[in-house]
Interface confidence: low
Amino acid sequence: RDKVMSEFNNNFRQQMENYPKNNHTASILDRMQADFKCCGAANYTDWEKIPSMSKNRVPDSCCINVTVGCGINFNEKAIHKEGCVEKIGGWLRKNVLEQKLISEEDLGGEQKLISEEDLHHHHHH
């Protein structure tokens, strides 16, 4: 499990770097951040470290009330500050890893970090 979570953390950060360059990658992180009400890997300041993200900007999916452009010149009170790795990791341990194995292939590269089915289950329960 620790290996899987370490892999998840590494992949999440890797996908963050691809966010400005790849719509598909962006969509994965957007869905996760919006559904789990989180922002960045450890916290929202991680987005400052992404070279091609403009300064003082987070993805719109970090916003508490998501609207297009809400992440530009954001107000800290208007975004989710908690990091996604810890939040999703805790949920994964509790709800997914105990019920089924997640292969490294599922967690790797351009694959979904968590299956849409799992996200949907979280989102509606």
């Epitope: 957007d30 998501v66 609207t67 297009v68 694959q111 979904k112 299956s115």
Partner: antibody, heavy 119, light 108 residues
Amino acid sequence: QVQLVESGGGLVKPGGSLRLSCAASGFTFSDYYMNWIRQAPGKGLEWITYINNGGYTKYYADSVKGRFIISRDNTKNSVHLQMNSLRAEDTAVYYCVRDPRMYYGMDVWGQGTTVTVSS
Amino acid sequence: DIQMTQSPSSLSASVGDRVTITCRASQSISSYLNWYQQKPGKAPKLLIYAASSLQSGVPSRFSGSGSGTDFTLTISSLQPEDFATYYCQQSYSTPPITFGQGTRLEIK
């Protein structure tokens, strides 16, 4: 250019089966989820199924659940829809569509293939 | 499931007119709303995504607005090629992906 081309439509009797195929070109197919959306004659658009980029997550509309199966072959840039136990109400134009992302609409549609279920 | 309701179902207008089509979601969908245009015998074409962003290649006379539950598609000055059926679609809570029932725009 970015393109989706459907094939496999035709006339089939109620209870019969049909397999639709969609050939993708001009983009990195394995990066994208894919959908099938249909439109009955004179009616609106109805989403029926999608498959994720890796092929391991699939969702179906209640109207086709248990009868239709979506699959994809990333090595051949293709997505398929196996339609079983066909009914008259499945008569429609079937579109292969690149998946909508969170902030992006469905920007690439095939030309559609017509399925007619009639005795 | 989120239901999408468009109004009007059909409308008649003349070239040069300003036209507005509305779409209402059964619950808040933030800005996850897309608009499509479909001409007879053709596949739908994406016009607007994320409620107000114009898809590449779409004329600037098309615009979208709204957030939450109420959205509008506006055509500032109708052109002959704009007579078609328009659909809204939510991408907030999927599956299922849901569309409005369509608005048919006809020549007066």
